[in-house]
């Protein structure tokens, strides 16, 4: 009795869904009551399918309402684990353990990344020096560096700070500021450059005609 996996690595985006599959041999018709399926993720039990039913009381709380065994796939010889609303904590090595006459197990790695897609921006001006402060902020994983460039492709020197997100423990909150003397309609770009998997996300900042003076300066 041998189980197989078509993929031993899945890469999924934070907040997305993933279905990981282990295939097991089924001759003729599946006898559900002879089938045993366990899914574990390191020290956490996710699925315990015995005697034709899933026992949710033994499921680890971190997977509650998010993980399920796709029962219809069992008849096709597939133990498919579906996880919805994927979290960074879901990353790791999963193990499917299947008993059907014989018994076997296989490991599958899940990697989770979070692109720095929603970049919020702010432009303010110092009334004394007339210097503009440009700010870009986004959350993602893993860590990113921020590259500032001008419309003529000059690389500019900004200041970046990285903190942990309030939303999720492992998510990074990356904020970068650029102080520069700029004129109206001038365009600047902040690019969040992330490695593993490599991805760039850029926001465009256009210097407005007139900026309101901060209330504290009035």
């Amino acid at each position: 009795f041998t189980i197989t996996v078509s993929k031993d690595l899945y890469v999924v985006e934070y907040g997305g869904n993933v279905t990981m599959e282990c295939k097991f041999p089924v001759e003729k018709q599946l006898n559900l009551f002879a089938l045993i399926v366990y899914w574990e993720m390191e020290d956490k039990k996710i699925i315990q399918f015995v005697n034709g039913k899933e026992d949710l009381k033994v499921q680890h709380s971190s997977y509650s309402q998010r993980a399920q065994l796709l029962k219809d796939q069992l008849f096709l010889g597939k133990a498919a684990l579906q996880i919805t609303d994927v979290r960074l904590q879901d990353a790791g090595v999963y193990c499917c353990l299947i008993g059907y006459g014989g018994a076997d197990y296989k490991r599958i790695t899940l990697k989770v990344h979070a692109p720095y897609r929603n970049i919020s921006q702010r432009i303010s001006v110092d009334p004394v020096t007339s210097e503009h402060e440009l700010m870009c902020q986004a959350e993602g994983y893993p860590e990113a560096e921020v590259i500032w460039t001008s419309s003529d492709h000059r690389v500019l020197s900004g200041k970046t700070t990285i903190t942990n997100s309030n939303r999720e423990e492992k998510l990074f909150n990356v904020t970068s500021t650029l102080n520069i003397n700029a004129t109206a309609n001038e365009i600047f770009y902040c690019t969040f450059q992330r490695s593993g998997p490599e991805e760039n996300n850029t926001a465009e900042l256009v210097i407005p005609e007139r900026l309101p003076v901060p209330a504290s300066e009035r």
Partner: antibody, heavy 121, light 112 residues
């Protein structure tokens, strides 16, 4: 109330093997992972491996790989741990322990009383 | 050499509070894994005190609490009592070893 009852103390010569049993009563045996943990005299706890009895699938700590075999008999709700090529450093109390709901390896809520294995020539 | 590092001993007087630390790495305590704590009296089997970092099984007094931050976990005992004198062990899953690991143990002495 779940109870794990282990076999009695054993004395073995270096190079030989020992097989310790752990009989469960008062709860579902086969679907919970059963681990074996040992404790040498005056030393700390050391995880050796685990089995899911309903599947008969066992995983072992790297240190014991090739020397330990964990098995289970669903019909008698008994788990077994066999350690071969015994040496004096294997003298220890061997415990079986059951993993609680939601977990696969740690978080042992029920323990056997322990079995002392003495390896001496 | 244990995978998780605990102080060899701690002590306190009755009524006092103590904390026992358990330091690991990113592959065990510092990962997404959960830490459990056990109490062991001489000649007895260990008893589960804390599971899943900070949860107490029924029957364990609320004087015992667990927490985790980064690659370290802690067991706190408030209002020390004579019967708390025992050895305490932390445990976690180690993803680099694909198995369970224990700390070396901490002997708690209740003075006086």
């Amino acid at each position: 109330q779940v109870q794990l009852v282990q076999s009695g103390a054993e004395v073995r010569k270096p190079g030989s093997s020992v097989k310790v049993s752990c009989k469960a009563s008062g709860g579902t045996f086969s679907s919970y992972a059963i681990s074996w943990v040992r404790q040498a005299p005056g030393q700390g706890l050391e995880w050796m491996g685990r089995i899911i009895p309903i599947l008969g699938i066992a995983n072992y700590a790297q240190k014991f790989q090739g020397r330990v075999t964990i098995t289970a008999d669903k019909s008698t709700s008994t788990a077994y741990m066999e350690l071969s090529s015994l040496r004096s450093e294997d003298t220890a109390v061997y415990y079986c322990a059951r993993t609680m709901d939601g977990y696969s390896y740690g978080n042992f809520d029920y323990w056997g009383q322990g079995t002392l294995v003495t390896v001496s020539s | 050499q244990s995978a998780l590092t605990q102080p060899a001993s701690v002590s306190g007087s009755p009524g006092q509070s103590i904390t026992i630390s358990c330091t690991g790495t990113s592959s065990d305590v510092g990962g997404y894994n959960y830490v459990s704590w056990y109490q062991q009296h001489p000649g007895k089997a260990p008893k589960l005190l804390i599971y899943g970092n900070s949860n107490r099984p029924s029957g364990v007094p609320d004087r015992f609490s667990g927490s985790k931050s980064g690659t370290s976990a802690s067991l706190a005992i408030t209002g020390l009592q004579a019967e708390d004198e025992a050895d305490y062990y932390c445990q976690s899953y180690d993803s680099s070893l694909s198995g369970s690991v224990f700390g070396g143990g901490t002997k708690l002495t209740v003075l006086g």
